[in-house]
């Protein structure tokens, strides 16, 4: 065993920025730190065969399989993948170890499989086996967390039934509103499933795994806060657990809290109370209303009453299926070149949506913000004044929603011209869509004032890339204008732009471009 070379097999996972096929390489691209693959001698195999731990990567990932050999003298090598030989160029690192690399760019199903590396050194021959597969993320799920009461304890358990198993954390905040933003110093995170401190102002539970992060807020009515102008509304699907927390603070302990559903007291077993003294010796009470699995008849107005505070209510609506409510009619906007502008979509949805904004086949992250009236809003401001079609797409477990926007940027026309043997064409993308004039330049009209009306054909066409309109005008060649200079002009309310063309020339001959404001 001690005569065998010391072999180290590593995986290097690259930040994706290339797009070609797998190749053997002596100098892999700059990357993340190498990950050891625990290369081990394969038991009971004929010859010396090492195997590396199975590699499992995402589709489109770029990786390098690398072997470092601590053996004296030169080495030669050969990669074999699916019965094809791939050439191999070993090099030596600073510790004088032989280094052999196989770069796989943009991993695809066809590049998954067994990669065999045959190495010949002065002392011995051996084989290294790498098995590369694509991670099956189709089986991955990330479900929104929900709450359960801990058996025999006044504590909440946060559960998220997700694959791979998520990390669960409580996100707690004791201030109001904006200061409870995720990265605010007022926010405390606890990476555990059980929470005993249930008196905080804002309590959320979040679950995260390879697919992202999902959070659920503990719905709270605070009797010391002035009620919202619109009644708070909580949506749930049949079978989901209901949790509402009622919180009240008073100068002493001489007060009680009760829950009612449609003026009927909640049954015992559907609520529990906790109380504590705060730092200034005031008494905080919280009363939880909970139903482990809601049915349609749990819909209604849940009212929390106190002997020392005005009561407050919330409307709980139980639905069979999730929904996304918003107007899906398309909207057109026209703005000036430097005008500040954001697209926005106002919607009501349950469960919470995942959304994207798309422009020119490129997706942008989508942020959503809850409004006081139970609606949410998503805004998109990053259009960089590019005209075209913008798409908002939202979905949750049960519903999908798409809304189209068109953005037009007001600007004067820019003209491009081209000519063929039989016609001359001019194109412009200004907005509003320009009108066209053609003029002939001759001895009689050196300033090109003689208008051409015959043989002119105007049209507007959709330039697919951005979904924006382009206007064009074509002049068919006639004997009367052959050999002359002609000028096409596009004009709209913001100005005029012209291009001069010599007819009868084989290609475009932009003679002069005039910009007339």
């Amino acid at each position: 065993n001690q005569d065998l070379p010391v072999i180290k097999c590593v995986l290097i996972n690259h930040k994706n920025n290339d797009s070609s096929v797998g190749k053997s390489s002596s100098y892999p691209m700059v990357s993340e730190s190498p990950e050891d693959l625990g290369c081990a001698l394969r038991p009971q195999s004929s010859g010396t065969v090492y195997e590396a731990a199975a590699v499992e990567v995402d589709v489109s990932a770029s990786i390098t399989l690398q072997v470092l050999v601590d053996a004296p003298g030169n080495i030669s090598c050969l990669w074999v993948f699916k019965h094809s030989s791939l050439n191999c160029q070993p090099h030596f690192d600073l510790q004088n170890r032989g280094v052999v690399s196989m770069v796989i760019l943009k991993m695809t199903e066809t590049q998954a499989g067994e990669y065999l590396l045959f190495i010949q050194s002065e002392a011995t021959n051996y084989t290294i086996l790498f098995t590369v597969s694509i991670r099956n993320t189709l089986l991955y799920t990330l479900r929104r967390p929900y709450f359960r009461k801990m058996e025999n304890q006044d504590a909440l358990v946060c559960i998220s039934e997700s694959v791979p198993e998520p990390i669960v954390e409580w996100v707690l905040c004791d201030s109001q509103g904006e200061s409870c933003k995720e990265e605010s110093p007022a926010v405390v995170k606890k990476e555990e499933k059980v929470l005993h401190e249930l008196f905080g102002t804002d309590i959320r539970c979040c679950a995260r795994n390879e697919l992202g992060r999902e959070c659920t807020r503990l719905f709270t009515i605070d009797l010391n806060q002035t009620p919202q102008t619109t009644l708070p509304q909580l949506f749930l699907k049949v079978g989901e657990p209901l949790w509402i927390r009622c919180k009240a603070v008073h100068v002493n302990h001489g007060f009680g809290l009760t829950w009612e559903l449609e003026n009927k007291a909640l049954e015992e077993g559907n609520y529990f109370e906790m109380s504590t003294y705060s730092t200034n010796r005031t008494m905080i009470r919280i009363l939880f209303a909970f139903v482990s699995s809601v049915a349609r008849n749990d819909t209604g107005y849940y009212t929390c009453s106190s002997s020392k505070h005005p009561s407050q209510s919330a409307l709980v609506t139980i639905v069979e299926k999730g929904f996304i409510n918003a107007t899906n009619s398309s909207e057109d906007y026209e703005i000036d070149q430097y005008e500040e502008f954001c697209f926005s979509v106002r919607f009501k949805a349950y469960p919470q949506i995942r959304c994207t904004w798309t422009f020119s086949r490129k997706s942008f992250p989508c942020e959503q913000k809850g409004l006081d009236n139970g609606y949410s809003i998503s805004k998109f401001c990053n259009h960089k004044h590019q005209p075209g079609e913008y798409i908002f797409h939202a979905e949750n477990d049960d519903a999908q929603f798409t809304k189209m926007f068109t953005l037009n940027i007001r600007r004067k026309p820019q003209v491009l011209a081209e000519a063929s043997a039989s016609q001359a064409s001019c194109f412009s993308d200004g907005y509003p869509l320009p009108s066209w004039t053609w003029k002939k330049c001759s001895d009689k009209s050196p300033n090109c004032t003689e208008e051409i009306t015959e043989g002119v054909w105007n049209r507007k066409a959709n330039r697919k890339v951005f979904g924006q309109w382009v206007s064009s005008s074509t002049l068919n060649m006639s004997e009367a204008i052959k050999g002359f200079l002609v000028k096409c002009c596009a004009y709209n309310s913001l100005g005029t732009s012209c291009e001069t063309i010599l007819l009868n020339s084989p290609g475009p001959f932009p003679f002069i471009q005039d910009n007339i404001s």
């Epitope: 996972n13 990950e35 050891d36 693959l37 038991p43 009971q44």
Partner: antibody, heavy 127, light 107 residues
Framework: QVTLKESGPVLVKPTETLTLTCTVS??????????VSWIRQPPGKALEWLAH???????SYRTSLKSRLTISKDTSKSQVVLTMTNMDPVDTATYYC???????????????????WGQGTTVTVSS | DIQMTQSPSSLSASLGDRVTITCRAS??????LGWYQQKPGKAPKRLIY???TLQSGVPSRFSGSGSGTEFTLTISSLQPEDFATYYC?????????FGQGTKVEIK
């Protein structure tokens, strides 16, 4: 270089919950079929395998302690966490974490046990 | 669960001796057995896996054999650094299980 480092409280009171963290470096809990095991050793006694978790979140527990153990991983922090509820003085031990590479493919994996170990952390359960 | 019975629980030997430690599984585990060496105050170190495959960097005086239920670790010529406790581990079936250990002491 592959390293595993255990961390957690030195002293735990009976009935409390023990949370141990194993921070790994030099290998990944994402891109390769890698697992991490927890093993303990009471003073002067034999090694006891407790639990493991693999990169695909598959896990297994020692039968006699199954109801008290939870193993989880946080790949973003390269950590594996073991929690053990209702601690008792008999749980006083040195707790080790160790790496388990998985070989093979297409769902058919084989293991050769733990190849690299952490240095261990000693936990005493006492009131 | 699979029980692993190691024998002897301790032994005394001299430098240069040939030492044999046995591990018996309560049911067949093919060759899914490893041997670990542990010195006082240190973490265990793998010597052998898959019953007979020597871990890289381990001296060739260590060897393993066996299959099914009977396994053996042999140290062909005991060296001063070999005085330690040795454990077998079955990695055939979860939950994995260790033997109770064999302490090798200087005679």
């Amino acid at each position: 270089q592959v390293t595993l480092k255990e961390s957690g409280p030195v002293l735990v009171k009976p009935t409390e919950t023990l949370t141990l963290t194993c921070t790994v470096s030099g290998f990944s809990l994402i891109n390769a079929r890698m697992g991490v095991s927890w093993i303990r050793q009471p003073p002067g006694k034999a090694l006891e395998w407790l639990a493991h978790i693999f990169s695909n979140a598959e896990k297994s527990y020692r039968t006699s302690l199954k109801s008290r153990l939870t193993i989880s991983k946080d790949t973003s922090k390269s950590q594996v966490v073991l929690t053990m509820t209702n601690m008792d003085p008999v749980d006083t031990a040195t707790y080790y974490c160790a790496r388990i590479p998985g070989y093979g493919g297409n769902g058919d994996y084989h293991y050769y046990g733990m190849d690299v170990w952490g240095q261990g952390t000693t936990v005493t359960v006492s009131s | 669960d699979i029980q692993m019975t190691q024998s002897p629980s301790s032994l005394s030997a001299s430098l240069g001796d040939r030492v044999t430690i046995t591990c018996r599984a309560s049911q067949g585990i093919r060759n899914d057995l490893g041997w670990y060496q542990q010195k006082p105050g240190k973490a265990p170190k793998r010597l052998i896996y898959a019953s007979s495959t020597l871990q890289s960097g381990v001296p060739s005086r260590f060897s393993g054999s066996g299959s099914g239920t009977e396994f053996t670790l042999t140290i062909s010529s005991l060296q001063p650094e070999d005085f330690a406790t040795y454990y077998c581990l079955q990695h055939n079936n979860f939950p994995w299980t260790f033997g109770q250990g064999t302490k090798v002491e200087i005679k």
